[in-house]
């Protein structure tokens, strides 16, 4: 959401979020690291092209033209500098001048050594308990952001992992239309449209970098879960990894796993949508997970087949009109899982990414809650690996990523909601090893084992 330094009355009233980097001569003397040439404070550029007609409530949602409702000036960093105050490097770069290229490798969770597995689980648990060092979350919409007295900004600290959950919730929440009116639900800034893959790519990148900083470990990388096994069991659901099934309640995680102690955020949907509040940092009930347990829906009791990945990677066009969850012959809609693996749209189908979520049959299967189950991370790194392989095979052909008339939030140049500093879909539509500093060690069905460089 927003840097802690900008969650104050003055910044909100001025609409300026250009925090100091090293203000040696007092506050406001080094916005965006300008004194050392790292960046400068400039006007925000937000996409103003038309979106599709799915969303008829222009003017009612804080996420429109993100982030202009909140801030119209922010840091623009030079060269490879990055971050809310240009104090870090762009992904894939390091060093005092951000001119040293680096590459981290995302590997299959099952291929990690016992020590690496343990380190990953402990790191996730640490992220759940560690206050995010930079960002705070809004707990009220913009019109109520200064509190009942107009003088108390409604922001809260939140943990690194819960921030990851909150950003996802904020991107999918309904549009509040007013007290007594039903909130509008046919809006989603991160799913059912071309931005699905780019949005989730940045989402993972943010978490990965937050965890690198938290651990002081630049090589830390998020592993993936190859969910395309065709099996009816969750092979990462063991107590040394993501937690086995509890013997006492088949919908809970075993008490032998640290994840049984996790409590979810953003579960009070009814309250948010009727009162117009936002999810806050308050934790609620436990993670629910019942892999293959949806007996009423046999189609989601088995994970995708390996050949489903092979087939979806043969869909050459990134996206097709209407750029929605009913697009056919669209790679994005296929990997998202609204089309059959061949690319053909079928309203009855749930495949690949969607099928993996639904297979989990619990917290991980509910869009507004799904990141609360840390399997979400692994599921999405694998989805991102498929995306990166598509980008590699088809030379990152962005021509069918629409500049306009996509669902709101999904135009090519839209700033992805609610990421900060503003970042467009285009910026994530690049091959990861060359441009984002990470690669996947992965074997695609029928191919040799490679690191995707």
């Amino acid at each position: 959401q927003f840097p802690r330094e900008c969650a104050n009355i003055e910044a909100l009233r001025r609409g300026v979020c250009c925090p100091d980097l090293l203000p040696s001569s007092g506050p406001g003397t080094d916005p965006c690291g300008s004194s050392s040439g790292r960046g400068r404070c400039v006007a925000v550029i937000a996409d103003s092209r038309p979106h599709s007609r799915h969303y008829p409530h222009d003017g009612k949602d804080d996420r429109e033209a993100w982030p202009l409702r909140f801030f119209n000036r922010t840091c623009q960093c030079n060269d490879n500098f990055s971050g809310h105050n240009c104090g870090t490097c762009r992904p894939g770069w390091r060093g005092a001048a951000c001119n040293q290229k680096i590459l981290t490798v995302r590997r299959n969770l099952l291929d990690l050594s016992p020590e690496e597995k343990s380190h990953f689980v402990r790191a996730l648990d640490m992220a759940k308990r560690t206050t995010h060092p930079q960002f705070v979350i809004a707990t009220r919409r913009l019109e109520d952001i200064l509190g009942p007295d107009g003088n108390t900004p409604q922001f809260e600290n939140i943990s690194v992992y819960n921030y990851f959950v909150w950003t996802h919730y904020y991107s999918v929440k309904k549009t509040f239309l007013g007290t007594g009116q039903e909130s509008f639900g046919d809006v989603d800034f991160s799913h059912e449209g071309p931005a699905f893959l780019t949005w989730h790519r940045y989402h993972l990148l943010q978490l990965e970098r937050d965890m690198q900083e938290m651990l002081q470990e630049p090589s830390f990388s998020l592993p993936y879960w190859n969910f395309a096994t065709g099996k009816n069991v969750c092979d990462v659901c063991t107590d040394d990894l993501m937690g086995s099934r509890s013997n006492f309640d088949s919908t809970l995680i075993s008490p032998n796993s640290v994840f049984s102690q996790w409590r979810v955020v953003c579960e009070s949907l009814e309250e948010y949508d009727t009162l117009g509040t936002l999810c806050n940092s308050t934790e609620g009930g436990p993670i629910r997970r019942n892999p293959a347990g949806n007996v009423g829906r046999p189609a989601v009791q088995r994970l995708p087949e390996p050949q489903d990945v092979t087939q979806c990677l043969e869909v050459r066009v990134f996206d097709t009109p209407p750029f929605y969850s009913n697009s056919t012959d669209s790679f994005r809609n296929t990997v998202e899982g609204y089309s059959a693996p061949t690319g053909k749209y079928d309203p009855a189908v749930r495949s690949l990414h969607n099928l993996a979520h639904l297979f989990l049959n619990g917290t991980g299967g509910q869009t507004h809650l799904s990141p609360n189950d840390p399997i979400f991370v692994l599921l999405h790194t694998f989805t991102d690996a498929v995306f990166d392989e598509w980008l590699r095979r088809y030379n990152a052909d962005i021509s069918t990523f629409p500049l306009e008339n996509a669902p709101i939030g999904h135009n090519r140049q839209y700033n992805m909601v609610p990421f900060w500093p503003p970042v467009t879909n285009t910026e994530m539509f690049v091959t990861a090893p060359d441009n984002l500093g990470y690669a996947y060690e992965v074997q695609w069905p029928g191919q040799e084992f490679t690191v995707s460089e």
């Epitope: 390091r94 005092a96 040293q100 560690t130 470990e217 630049p218």
Partner: antibody, heavy 121, light 107 residues
């Protein structure tokens, strides 16, 4: 002036535990990660782990997991290393040291004078 | 874990000479490397960070270089006060291991 002042030498029995302190001055420990390093007699340096005093997070080298425990008291700008189940192999000088992570600076830039621990019956 | 192989284990040189100590990492550590000097009975002292940046107050006769898995510390115009043990340490991945050390003796 940045300083890390460590507690004095300790003579302890095998199986016992010892708690070493490192009082810092000249900087706020909440802004740094504090690391601990071991050096056995006539041997090299071994990294034990770090603590982030701002939130209490700790990370250890797996070989010290379970025997070393790092804590911090931000009100007195002091960090502690507790070692349990001591054996003669733990006879060593223990150093506290700090790392600035603001720019991912790869270095431990200031060190305490070291605290000698002798494990003997 | 990244292993750091340091060589030589010891060396002897005369005042005014140039010596080079090397550290080889078992994987690419992307310049996340520091060099320290430790004199007998004293604490280690930072010489170089980020593989090639000299720490404050360190004489310019010390220099760090390298990339990927191979790094070196060069000391030119040796002085008598340069005797002691030298260690490298990486900060790429946990745990942040040290090299085994090099004992430098001034003849």
């Amino acid at each position: 002036e940045v300083q890390l002042q460590q507690s004095g030498a300790e003579l302890v029995r095998p199986g016992a535990l010892v708690k070493l302190s490192c009082k810092t001055s000249g900087f706020n420990i909440k802004d740094y990660f504090l690391h601990w390093v071991r050096q056995r007699p006539d041997q090299g340096l071994e990294w034990i782990g770090w603590i982030n005093p701002d939130n209490g997070n700790t990370v250890y080298d797996p070989k010290f997991q379970g025997t070393a425990s790092l804590t911090a008291d931000t009100s007195s700008n002091t960090v502690y290393l507790q070692l349990s189940g001591l054996t003669s192999e733990d006879t060593a000088v223990y150093f506290c040291t700090r790392r600035d992570y603001t720019y991912e600076k790869a270095a431990l830039d200031y060190w305490g004078q070291g605290a000698s621990v002798i494990v003997s019956s | 874990d990244i292993q750091m192989s340091q060589s030589p284990a010891s060396l002897s040189a005369s005042v005014g000479e140039t010596v080079t100590i090397t550290c080889r990492a078992s994987g690419n550590i992307y310049n996340y490397l520091a060099w320290y000097q430790q004199k007998q009975g004293k604490s280690p002292h930072l010489l170089v960070y980020d593989a090639k940046t000299l720490a404050d107050g360190v004489p310019s006769r010390f220099s760090g270089s390298g990339s990927g898995t191979q790094y070196s510390l060069k000391i030119s115009s040796l002085q008598t006060e340069d005797s002691g043990n030298y260690y490298c340490q990486h900060f790429w991945s946990l745990p942040f291991t040290f090299g085994s050390g090099t004992k430098l003796e001034i003849k």
